[in-house]
């Protein structure tokens, strides 16, 4: 039920990468505006994105307070220019989102290879420890800070002259691999949370190859 000139939001979808979390919905508003509320299972509703004509709302500030909580959002529809107006049931139309647990569900962003250094037949590859918007003691935590040992990185590496890929894994942000002397190698990394059931892997990082700027080389 509700007034004839408002429609309830639908297709409420969480879009979240490295805890940057946006709720999206439909339809594009015609003569109506939206307000979003978010709550934990046991908490009070908090209103966000008041009377907006957007069909998305950035809820990052709320979910980063505790990424292991399970959140629920709802989107209210109001007639444009008359936000006090309610549906015939005495309240605005609204639709609930699916539940969302950031720790379990946020997508892993594309990682970046920070550097690589060759010393003889060893190469040390370092993955950038990306900063998230999760805070503790007034400092922003890195992805590693948040996920700890749940997060691993997989390195794919291959000789520039061939396509046969090798892999290595680490639960830090560094790899130390053996290479053939005199050969140039290319590298790509992927973030993985092996024990997840959904959103287990990131996309692959951009490929970095030896002989380009990122690396350092020291012959022993």
């Amino acid at each position: 039920s509700g007034t004839t000139n408002t429609v309830a939001a639908y297709n409420l979808t969480w879009k979240s990468t490295n805890f940057k979390t946006i709720l999206e919905w439909e339809p594009k508003p015609v003569n109506q505006v939206y307000t979003v509320q978010i709550s934990t299972k046991s908490g009070d509703w908090k209103s966000k994105c008041f009377y907006t004509t957007d069909t998305e709302c950035d809820l990052t500030d709320e979910i980063v307070k505790d990424v292991k909580q399970t959140y629920l959002a709802r989107v209210f529809s109001y007639p444009a220019g008359n936000v006090e107006s309610t549906g015939s049931a005495g309240e605005p139309l609204y639709e609930n989102s699916p539940e969302f647990t950031p720790y379990l569900e946020t997508n892993l962003g594309q990682p970046t290879i920070q550097s690589f250094e060759q010393v003889g037949t060893k190469v040390n590859v370092t993955v950038e420890d990306e900063r998230t918007l999760v805070r503790r003691n007034n400092t922003f935590l890195s992805l590693r800070d948040v996920f700890g040992k749940d997060l691993i990185y997989t390195l794919y590496y291959w000789k520039s002259s061939s396509s046969g890929k090798k892999t290595a894994k680490t639960n830090t942000n560094e790899f130390l691999i053996d290479v053939d002397k005199g050969e140039n190698y290319c590298f790509s990394v992927q973030a993985v949370i092996p024990s997840r059931t959904v959103n287990r892997k990131s996309t692959d990082s951009p490929v970095e190859c030896m002989g380009q700027e990122k690396g350092e080389f020291r012959e022993i």
Partner: antibody, heavy 118, light 107 residues
């Protein structure tokens, strides 16, 4: 179906060592940390340590660090817990448990009773 | 290490009663709390994780709440099969630590 099957009961003399096995099946063994928890008769649960089956890296409860060794055999999907210099207060049921994403122990072995008696 | 204080250590209630167990952490563990059920002679079973999330297949009469240092586990309507010892555990900071347990019996 995820299963953790532990080795049978052991009776040991004080000062000896015991090695308990935990064979995992029904999931990717290297994707989850394996933990060890013990429970003395009539007592609560006490965490001993955990091992990453992918790398073999382990973390121990300081209380047991000098006496416990955790290992894995990836070829047989088996985790091992060895406790040395046994004393009577080590008499307990020892459990292996798979740590789920974020920390909780979702699957447990059936337990192995270790009795230390002279 | 973080100490977990669980209370009461035992309780007796009638079938259908609402049962509440509390767990207090010696420092904030955010939502890093799990609750387990252990029946005599059996391995513990995970019921609740992240303070309030029911694990797969766990009946809806079991629930958890709390944040920071104070947590509550509730059985909304006690059933005969719920006779067991219940443990809280913090999985926020290693070493992982357990509460002392609460033995639940039927009156």
């Amino acid at each position: 179906e995820v299963q953790l099957v532990q080795s049978g009961a052991e009776v040991k003399k004080p000062g000896a060592s015991v090695k308990v096995s935990c064979k995992a099946s029904g999931y990717s063994f290297t994707g989850y940390y394996m933990n060890w928890v013990r429970q003395a008769p009539g007592q609560g649960l006490e965490w001993m340590g955990e091992i990453n089956p992918s790398t073999g890296g382990s973390t121990y409860n300081q209380k047991f660090k000098a006496r416990v060794t955790l290992t894995v055999d990836q070829s047989t999907n088996t985790a091992y817990m060895e406790l040395s210099s046994l004393r009577s207060e080590d008499t307990a049921v020892y459990y292996c448990a798979r740590r789920e994403l974020g920390g909780p122990f979702g699957y447990w072995g059936q337990g192995t009773t270790v009795t230390v008696s002279s | 290490s973080i100490q977990m204080t669980q209370s009461p250590s035992s309780l007796s209630a009638s079938v259908g009663d609402r049962v509440t167990i509390t767990c207090k952490a010696s420092q904030s563990v955010s939502s890093g709390i799990a609750w387990y059920q252990q029946k005599p002679g059996k391995s513990p079973k995970l019921l609740i994780y992240f303070a309030s999330n029911r694990y797969t297949g766990v009946p809806s009469r079991f629930s958890g709440s709390g944040y920071g240092t104070d947590f509550t586990f509730t059985i909304s309507s006690l059933q005969p099969e719920d006779i067991a010892t219940y443990y809280c555990q913090q999985d926020y900071s290693s070493p992982w630590t357990f509460g002392g347990g609460t033995k639940v019996e039927i009156k």
